[in-house]
Interface confidence: low
């Protein structure tokens, strides 16, 4: 089995990931591994010479680049925050800040926007991946309520008055909790059956 550099008449190389075709000499040469770049190009008698990327630069893939890519910070103005630092083999990993979703995507997220509020009586449908899309608000299921306008508030179960030794004064709705009262407390005048003489 030939070791780079080797002649190639059909302009293809055996290992597409780790080799590339060099048209000037019509040969297959080694690519440089992740974290490195080409410091000297290959020739018919010498294979590619690779060097390690300098600090604050990277190359993610097997490559024949003569430079490393500059590490870029996550831009907080665009609503991004860092989840993993840049290394010689990987660019800075960013995600949308809490309460935001990715509004523009080009191989990676370029900027995030604030999640829409879900109105009272609803909650944001849970997604597989946080930050991938805007909120889709769904109604609270039966026996639950949510009483704020918020991008992240969850519907809570209605209070069960009997669990607290109380009785129900007013039933809960999708937007409000059950109102409980002491069983010994009289009903307010407008709710009692008193007759005026």
């Amino acid at each position: 089995q030939a070791v780079p550099p080797y002649a190639s008449e059909n302009q293809t190389c055996r290992d597409q990931e780790k080799e590339y075709y060099e048209p000037q000499h019509r040969i297959c040469c080694s690519r440089c591994p992740p974290g490195t770049y080409v410091s000297a190009k290959c020739s018919r008698i010498r294979d590619t010479v690779c060097a390690t990327c300098a600090e604050n630069s990277y190359n993610e893939h097997w490559n024949y680049l003569t430079i490393c890519q500059l590490c870029r910070p996550c831009d907080p103005v665009m609503g991004l925050e860092e989840i993993a630092p840049c290394t010689s083999k990987r660019k800075t990993q960013c995600r949308c800040q809490p309460g935001m979703f990715c509004a523009a995507w080009a191989l990676e997220c370029t900027h995030c926007e604030l999640l829409s509020d879900c109105p009272p009586g609803t909650e944001a449908e849970l997604k597989d991946e946080v930050g991938k899309g805007n909120n889709h608000c769904v109604p609270c299921k039966a026996g639950h309520f949510q009483n704020t306008s918020s991008p992240s508030a969850r519907c809570q179960p209605h209070t069960r008055c009997e669990n607290q030794g109380l009785v129900e004064a007013a039933p809960g709705t999708a937007q409000s909790d059950t109102t409980c009262k002491n069983p010994l407390e009289p009903l307010p005048p407008e709710m009692s059956g008193t007759m005026l003489m």
Epitope: V77, G79, A103, A104, W105, H111, E113, L114
Partner: nanobody, 112 residues
Framework: DVQLVESGGGLVQPGGSLRLSCKAS????????FGWYRQAPGKQRELVAT???????WYDVSVKGRFTISRDNAKNTVYLQMNSLRPEDTAVYYC??????WGQGTLVTVSS
Amino acid sequence: DVQLVESGGGLVQPGGSLRLSCKASGTTFSDRAFGWYRQAPGKQRELVATISTAGLTWYDVSVKGRFTISRDNAKNTVYLQMNSLRPEDTAVYYCNTFRGNWGQGTLVTVSS
């Protein structure tokens, strides 16, 4: 469904300027982020600039300082002001809503 119509392309000399427009219909315009992409002959489509609903902008390093993206919510239109144009800016320019909607594009040719 969202319809996008780009216009404003043409032939311009190096160093010249053009203003591209993207008119959107069939969507609540102010609720959408928009971006301008370009595709040069034989190359992949690349993102050039984006603008969020709040007006936050992002530019690719190749156009930063030369191109300006803006939006007019009243006119349902996104613009790309392109100054100091170079031959390598030659491409078909497309606008996009980041939800799979593409227009037909407008050709920009920078040549002397």
